[in-house]
């Protein structure tokens, strides 16, 4: 039995949030990634990738970049200038269709204060495309990319998962992934 | 409770190799990404290498590309270093961590396993 | 890669007194830095995540702050077992995860 507990993240306005999520290369290479943030029951998708996914490629919804990484099996999440109102519950998932998705690790609990960050967020914003090429024994990324494209996305799609989110998530049975059901 | 204990320290002459362990419990192995720290004596903390959870890529610290090599046995809930070509420098206490959330700190130590390399 | 610069070396604070660490990146790191303690011949512990996040299990005297490129740990009232060693690690973007050379905080 697996049981997914959420990670907490404390952050002040304006910083930045960044979580790696990792997938099977074998199974997901090829598949769209999402950034979710859970509302009540319902998951609301915020941003998602291409398909098929490119390296060093991001995808850009407002605040919000998703990276995928096919290679490593990564996936790169970035949300920068963080306010007060994010706060919640987020998930990295696969999307492989609107009326299902897969949860990848485990969930995220942001909780944004206000309050000095140290740094204003706007000027992290220098550092965010700026990426190291990494040390690994798994192919290595494409050239870097020299321009990223900003993709439009449509609003939000909402599905309904069939968990409650409480202080604490415990999701059992669970292998690699989760399937969450949606209904329409 | 989660538990990492490293074994396969020892000495060992430069050029030879040894591969050290890190068994764990206490929590789901396969999902984490773990990492190799070491600490030469009386010195600060190095990064030696990861291997990632569901993924499986490795990275390693430049310091010991091409002669370590990190795997994990997820049947055994165990994670290995391979050190070969080993030099006096390699020589420090060795650590196994397991790496928090999807971030690459870590929230869980081993008590270290030494390694010394000397002729 | 990104070297972490802290300073100062040794920081000799006496007990109750309050202790501030700093820590410095080459390039910025946004908000992915991380502390730990260290006491002799043990393995490190994780306080201090995601620049400002306390670890589970640890004190509030513990504080981070800082973005970027600078960052602080601040203990706020020292306690007998806070004396050792403390690392900050930045986990920004891709390996190699680097560490400070470490402050020690010794008894005044």
């Known amino acids: 039995t697996t049981e997914l507990t959420e990670e907490k993240y404390e952050y002040k306005e304006g910083q930045t949030l960044e979580v790696k999520c990792d997938y099977a290369l074998e199974k997901y290479a090829n598949s769209r990634k999402a950034w979710q943030k859970m509302e009540g029951k319902m998951p609301k998708i915020l941003a998602k990738t291409e398909r098929p996914s490119e390296n060093s490629h991001p995808v850009q919804v407002g605040r919000i970049t998703l990276e995928d990484y096919p290679d490593h099996g990564l996936l790169q999440v970035r949300m920068t200038n963080l306010q007060v109102e994010d706060s919640g519950l987020y998930q990295c998932v696969i999307y492989q269709h609107p009326k299902e998705s897969h949860v990848l690790f485990n969930p995220i609990c942001l909780v944004v204060t206000k309050g000095s960050s140290g740094t204003p967020g706007s000027s992290e914003n220098s550092t965010q495309n700026v990426y190291r090429t990494p040390s690994t024994t798994a192919k290595a990324l494409g050239p870097r990319y020299t321009s990223p494209r900003t993709v439009t996305q449509a609003p939000p799609e909402s599905t309904v998962v069939v968990s409650t989110p409480g202080s604490e998530i415990n999701l059992t049975n669970v292998t690699d992934i989760i399937r969450v059901p949606v209904f329409n | 409770e989660v538990q990492l204990l490293e074994s396969g320290g020892g000495m060992v002459q430069p050029g030879g190799s040894l591969r050290l362990s890190c068994a764990v419990s206490g929590f789901t192995f396969s999902r984490y990404a773990m990492s190799w720290v070491r600490q030469a004596p009386g010195k600060g903390l190095e990064w030696v290498s990861e291997?990632?959870?569901?993924?499986?890529?490795?990275y390693y610290a430049d310091s010991v590309k091409g002669r370590f090599t990190i795997s994990r046995d997820n049947s055994k809930n165990t994670l290995y270093l391979q050190m070969n070509s080993l030099r006096v420098e390699d020589t420090a206490i060795y650590y196994c961590?397991?790496?928090?959330?999807?971030?690459?700190?870590?929230?869980?130590w081993g008590q270290g396993t030494l390694v010394t390399v000397s002729s | 890669e990104i070297v972490m610069t802290q300073s100062p070396a040794t920081l000799s604070v006496s007990p109750g007194e309050r202790a501030t660490l700093s820590c410095r990146a080459s390039q910025s790191v946004n908000s992915n830095l991380a502390w730990y303690q260290q006491k002799p011949g043990r393995a490190p512990r994780l306080l201090i995540y995601g620049a400002s996040t306390r670890a589970t299990g640890i004190p509030a005297r513990f504080s981070g702050s800082g973005s970027g490129t600078e960052f602080t740990l601040t203990i706020s009232s020292l306690q007998s077992e806070d004396f050792a060693v403390y690392y900050c690690?930045?986990?920004?973007?891709?390996?190699?995860?680097?560490f400070g050379q470490g402050t020690k905080v010794e008894i005044k």
């Open positions: 291997m990632r959870g569901s993924s499986g890529s490795t």
């Open positions: 961590a397991k790496e928090f959330s999807s971030n690459s700190l870590f929230d869980y």
């Open positions: 690690q930045q986990f920004y973007n891709w390996p190699p995860w680097t």
